[in-house]
């Protein structure tokens, strides 16, 4: 299957690579602008050159193109725990990234939010916090892993998921209960 | 086919508590991010709270902060919201949500289910 390819695409497919095709005259292909800048004016005729021209601060452009307008630069989610690594320059969007021992939850393909990485108190840790991954964490005996944390087996409740890692305790327990009664 | 239904809502006085719940069909819910998303009367959807799969990871708004808690049950395949201290700005249809698209920092959903009413009145 040939993917279907917009109208742009199809115009540019047209002219060389590093070309577009001039929007008032087909004949005519222009040069991409730089990185870092926009598309000021066409080209007035083949081998002349376009008026590009550098985006504003607050804007930039990450690749040749030809558009009319920089793209507005992204800000880091406060609110998301976010923290900037590098801000945005002509020809670079801001990079927003976490602190350190924390680690990214995607929430969509391009909203994340920053998490401080587990300790694993009462375990081990089994894998290391990631970038995009907390921490895998390993329960001691006595201990079950809830929400990633290591949660003593005397709060395993029959109904939950932890009776069949904490069972010898409940047993214990129970025995415990037992023979205090005899 | 995905299904999600919500319950729960009604009205309630100012300062007053409610927990809505969801319930989800066709779909492994227990590895699924899931959100709960309100729209007020003449107003825009606003993304209100989230939780990732095992519950570990949540987000709430900063309007409902503090006085929302939402929480899951992968063995019900059910979505609760907790919502105390409610106030008359907390009237909304309050929706359960899947799969969150985020276009140019506005979050829209793929599926969602028919909502509950909360009206917040004295």
């Known amino acids: 299957l040939v993917p279907h390819l917009g109208d742009r695409e199809k115009r540019d497919s047209v002219c060389p690579q590093g070309k577009y095709i001039h929007p008032q005259n087909n004949s005519i292909c222009c040069t991409k602008c730089h990185k870092g800048t926009y598309l000021y004016n066409d080209c007035p005729g083949p081998g002349q050159d376009t008026d590009c021209r550098e985006c504003e601060s607050g804007s930039f452009t990450a690749s040749e193109n030809h558009l009319r307008h920089c793209l507005s630069c992204s800000k880091c989610r406060k609110e998301m725990g976010q923290v900037e690594i590098s801000s945005c320059t002509v020809d670079r969007d801001t990079v927003c990234g976490c602190r350190k021992n924390q680690y990214r939850h995607y929430w969509s393909e391009n909203l994340f939010q920053c998490f401080n990485c587990s300790l694993c108190l009462n375990g081990t840790v089994h894998l290391s916090c990631q970038e995009k991954q907390n921490t895998v964490c390993t329960c001691h005996a006595g201990f079950f892993l809830r929400e990633n944390e290591c949660v003593s087996c005397s709060n395993c409740k029959k109904s939950l998921e932890c009776t069949k890692l904490c069972l010898p305790q409940i047993e214990n327990v129970k025995g415990t209960e037992d023979s205090g009664t005899t | 086919e995905v299904q999600l239904l919500e319950s729960g809502g009604g009205l309630v006085q100012p300062g007053g508590s409610l927990r809505l719940s969801c319930a989800a069909s066709g779909f492994t819910f227990e590895r699924y991010d899931m959100f709960w998303v309100r729209q007020a009367p003449g107003k825009g959807l606003e993304w209100v709270s989230g939780?990732?799969?095992?519950?570990?990871?949540?987000y709430y708004a900063d309007s409902v902060k503090g006085r929302f808690t939402i929480s899951r049950d992968n063995s019900k395949n059910t979505l609760y919201l907790q919502m105390n201290s409610l106030r008359a700005e907390d009237t909304a249809v309050y929706y359960c949500a899947k799969d969150m698209i985020n276009y140019h920092g506005t979050p829209s959903f793929d599926y969602w289910g028919q909502g509950t009413l909360v009206t917040v009145s004295s």
């Open positions: 939780i990732s799969p095992r519950g570990r990871e949540t």
